[in-house]
């Protein structure tokens, strides 16, 4: 897998999507995980509802919330008041039983608000973690880099 | 194995600049940010700022910003940090350090440092 | 900024000892917390993440504990190897600060 980047500004919502194959994963659950250390387990934070047909119906834990569009085969994570200690690796998961297929590897990098002048350029970001070669970057809208593409210009 | 090599000592004058270069290797450059943390002679550890090696973006700390720019350049796997107008209390060990993949982690590999010494 | 404090700033030991460091933040982290070793001339090495994962390679003599805003560092038993400074940091607000170190001696 790949890894897909989305950015967000501290204390903004962040929306993830993960595609899938709808028929292939149909009848299956699915989790958002949160990957610990650079070769951690990922640790679940948060899943669908349990009876699959009501997938649809957004799942909170704390700040971070779950919603799956079974027909259309897009899970949609929202990261609420994105905050510094939120960048790091992710993964959408499909279950079944007590496996767990990934579908996604997702890295998040938290920007400082650039209207926020008391705390500008004031963040810490704590690095991202495994190889993405062909990754790209999803702000609101998202693309992939063309081969030997710049993604974008540095900014400060 | 994973490495950063910094660049060598600078003694450098109050006011001027000075450009301090991190090479990495063994791993892949653009899947991991770098940090920059300097530590006074005597003192504590402070850190600078970080830049993402995969698209440019950078968060400084306040402290330092509109004196301090983080660079990379991805062809040749090398993380640079430009601080200006120097005075004496910039007199540091500059060190870089590899993102470590999560927030819930800090730095695992760190360059071996250099020293910039700010003296008239 | 969330202030560190780290306590005690030296401690002298001996080898076989168990040395234990604090570490109090100024408002609570939940347990964004790491723990480092440096030794002169040295970059700082990552011993404990997440306050209490042991960081892969480090001896199993150190462990870290706590949430919220006090944590500890632990030793077991003290190694000639060990005898370095020791900060702590957390990872949890804007800007990531670090405690002001504690300098473990040969007593």
């Known amino acids: 897998h790949n890894t897909t980047v989305f950015q967000g500004v501290a204390g903004q919502s962040l929306q993830v999507s993960c595609p899938y194959d709808s028929m292939k994963h149909w009848g299956r659950r699915k989790a958002w995980c949160r990957q610990l250390g650079e070769k951690g387990p990922c640790q679940r934070v948060v899943s669908t509802h349990n009876l699959w047909l009501l997938s649809f119906l957004r799942r909170w834990n704390g700040s971070t919330a779950i919603t799956d569009d079974t027909l259309g085969g897009t899970l949609t994570i929202t990261l609420r008041n994105l905050q510094p200690h939120d960048a790091g690796l992710y993964q959408c998961q499909s279950l079944h039983g007590s496996e767990a297929d990934t579908l996604r590897k997702v890295l998040v990098e938290v920007l400082a608000d650039p209207l926020d002048h008391r705390d500008a350029g004031d963040l810490w970001f704590p690095g991202e973690s495994e190889s993405f070669e062909d990754a790209h970057v999803e702000h609101s809208i998202s693309r992939s880099l063309l081969e030997g593409e710049i993604p974008f210009p540095p900014t400060s | 194995q994973v490495q950063l090599v910094q660049s060598g000592a600078e003694v450098k004058k109050p006011g001027a600049s000075v450009k301090v270069s991190c090479k990495a290797s063994?791993?892949?450059?653009?899947?991991?940010?770098i940090s920059w943390v300097r530590q006074a002679p005597g003192q504590g550890l402070e850190w600078m700022g970080w830049?993402?090696?995969?698209?440019?973006?950078?968060n400084y700390a306040q402290k330092l910003q509109g004196r301090v720019t983080m660079t990379t350049d991805t062809s040749t796997s090398t993380a640079y940090m430009e601080l200006r107008s120097l005075r004496s209390d910039d007199t540091a060990v500059y060190y870089c350090?590899?993102?470590?993949?999560?927030?819930?982690?800090?730095?695992?590999?760190w360059g071996q440092g250099t020293l910039v010494t700010v003296s008239s | 900024d969330i202030q560190m404090t780290q306590s005690p700033s030296s401690v002298s030991a001996s080898v076989g000892d168990r040395v234990t460091i604090t570490c109090r933040a100024s408002?609570?982290?939940?347990?964004?917390l790491a723990w480092y070793q440096q030794k002169p001339g040295k970059a700082p090495k990552l011993l404990i993440y997440?306050?209490?994962s042991l960081q892969s390679g480090v001896p199993s003599r150190f462990s870290g504990s706590g949430s919220g805003t006090d944590f500890t560092l632990t030793i077991s038993s003290l190694q000639p190897e060990d005898f370095a400074t020791y900060y702590c940091?957390?990872?949890?607000?804007?800007?990531?600060?670090f405690g002001g170190g504690t300098k473990v001696e040969i007593k």
């Open positions: 408002q609570g982290i939940d347990s964004w």
């Open positions: 997440a306050a209490s």
């Open positions: 940091q957390q990872a949890y607000s804007l800007p990531p600060t």
């Open positions: 350090a590899r993102g470590s993949g999560s927030g819930y982690d800090s730095w695992y590999d």
């Open positions: 830049i993402s090696t995969y698209n440019g973006n950078t």
């Open positions: 063994g791993y892949t450059f653009t899947s991991y940010g």
